[in-house]
């Protein structure tokens, strides 16, 4: 449900579906790249799966010398720290033999810092966003996305990895946070709650949304995820809140309609290529940005988070499908897969628009307590 204060013209108000900003329906790919000798000349390899650490499953990108890289999926397991009143109690732990990083879970033992010391870092994610305290930064220009429109073939891999549903993205999806801040999309995944319980990771003035999408990107300055982990700006995540609206979201339906096929943990299916950008809000100019971490172990810091001001609207039925279809390990439902919000510890969240200006009649004077730091530094 939307809070009464979430108005169309206020921060984080207004979904991107309906007449205002329809989410265009497209397709989604995942056979990955082409063959070469075992993969034809000049083509890319199909991603192979290997277990390594990271937020959701971070793909590994080949060095540039090996052509525009294809992705190797590494199961970067996930767990979350307790502490949020709505934190899940019983789900989404990983259980892989011989892997010390496998016993993750949301809201239970082991404590995350024991799994990865970085999880006890000072600049962690997610955080609570307080628009009134955000620093308006005019230097934050509209995000640029290129190559996010994909034909139906090759298909894309959609997987229930036990802690989220993840879509592996092919090479060539380029995103720029600004001049010289260029990234390539690797994968996207979702976080959600349970019936009547919201499950976004970030919150706004303490308000938790029904769900949240994360599109994970690797800086073009790095060839591999493991090189970028912990490096400032090495990874960037685009995040958008999902909330309930009156109509079915056709872009999301292309994924949600396939969830029954991957209800079991570790199962996967192939979905036709689609317009990945249609899963995001249409307004790329209004967003919040801060430096944080992966929200799952290894909780590596230096991640640039961009949280859209505009939300994405899904129907009640679609939100129910998302939160009530997948299963984690054992007999536990895959639900409430979000981490508790973490302290800012002095960090200032920047806004690309004057988010601190309250448009309601109550605000006589605009309040903007923090000033903008130089963007792109």
């Amino acid at each position: 449900q939307r809070l009464p204060r979430m108005q169309e013209d206020s921060p984080l108000g207004g979904g991107s579906s309906g007449e205002d900003d329809p989410l265009g329906e497209e397709d989604l790919p995942s056979e990955e790249d082409s063959p070469r000798e075992e993969d034809p000349p000049g083509e890319e390899d199909l991603p192979g799966e290997e277990d390594l650490p990271g937020e959701e499953d971070l793909p590994e990108v080949k060095p540039k010398s090996e052509e525009e890289g294809s992705l190797k999926l590494e199961d970067l397991p996930t767990v979350e720290a307790p502490g949020d009143p709505q934190e899940p109690q019983n789900n989404a732990h990983r259980d892989k033999e011989g892997d010390d990083q496998s016993h993750w879970r949301y809201g239970g033992d082991p404590p995350w810092p024991r799994v990865s010391p970085a999880c006890a870092g000072r600049f962690q994610s997610p955080v609570d966003i307080r628009p009134q305290l955000a620093a308006f930064c005019p230097a934050l220009r509209p995000l640029e996305l290129l190559g996010f429109q994909l034909p139906p073939l090759p298909e894309l891999r959609l997987r229930n990895n036990g802690h989220s549903v993840q879509l592996t993205l092919p090479p060539g999806l380029e995103m720029a946070l600004g001049p010289g801040r260029e990234y390539r999309a690797l994968q996207l995944h979702l976080h959600w709650g349970a019936a009547g319980r919201p499950g976004s990771e970030h919150t706004v003035e303490g308000h938790r949304f029904p769900a949240e999408i994360h599109v994970v990107h690797l800086s073009t300055a790095f060839a591999r995820v493991d090189e970028a982990l912990g490096r400032p700006g090495g990874l960037a995540v685009l995040a958008a809140f999902l909330e309930e609206g009156p109509e079915e979201n056709s872009a999301y339906e292309q994924l949600l309609s396939r969830l029954e096929e991957i209800a079991e943990e570790g199962s996967e299916t192939q979905v036709p290529g689609l317009d990945i950008s249609a899963l995001l809000p249409s307004d790329f100019s209004r967003y919040f940005q801060y430096e944080g971490s992966l929200t799952t172990p290894p909780c590596a810091q230096g991640v640039i988070w961009t949280v859209f001001n505009q939300t994405v609207m899904l129907s009640a039925k679609q939100l129910h499908t998302l939160s009530d279809t997948l299963w984690g390990p054992g007999d536990s439902r895959l639900q409430l897969n979000f981490r508790a919000t973490q302290p800012l510890n002095g960090r200032v969240i920047e806004a690309s628009f004057p988010a601190g200006v309250d448009s309601s009649p109550r605000a006589a004077e605009p309040v903007q307590l923090n000033s903008c730091l130089a963007a792109g530094d």
Partner: antibody, heavy 119, light 111 residues
Amino acid sequence: EVQLVQSGGGLVQPGGSLRLSCAASGFTFSSYAMSWVRQAPGKGLEWVSAISANGGTTYYADSVKGRFTISRDNSKNTLYLQMNSLRAEDTAVYYCANNGNYRGAFDIWGQGTTVTVSS
Amino acid sequence: QSVLTQPPSVSGAPGQRVTISCTGSSSNIGAGFDVHWYQQLPGTAPRLLIYGNNNRPSGVPDRFSGSKSGTSASLAITGLQAEDETDYFCQSYDSSLSAWVFGGGTKVTVL
């Protein structure tokens, strides 16, 4: 060596049927989407049909919908195109092509096989 | 009539630069779908020359380059050589037709 070797072309009367085959080698055939593309004499290229890696999804050009059927046997590394109710305008060189390229390009092509529909 | 429009022919002297245009619409190139280019020598199958608007498969000389803007794309050949005299096709995907689409082809002549 990565290659696609085609067979099955020939002369057929209008209304007749023909089955084209495309045998793949040198790469993991079952991991890639495949297509058929044709070229009428002296003309340009026209996409005909496509099939996903596992064979679960198929796509057809409007000009052949309901008459042609694409299929694959991943255990035999072979792609097929069953052509029924053939018309004179189906006369062309038919190419099988791998469209597993991540951006939708056709990166590996068969040598082509000629289909002539004439009475 | 092809969905993507190419000039029937272009020509240039050896060593010169020639460009081939490929014009589409809001349901293919303009919708954000990538453009790919193929070279077809007489009597042979097409060969992928440029994929993803501006990427060259290994083995393709760097004399060939691609670009895309709005609803059109172009292929540039610099340092034109005699062996470049052949046919070139652009290709994309069209969401309205739900089909992979090609241009009509351009014959490059080396003077």
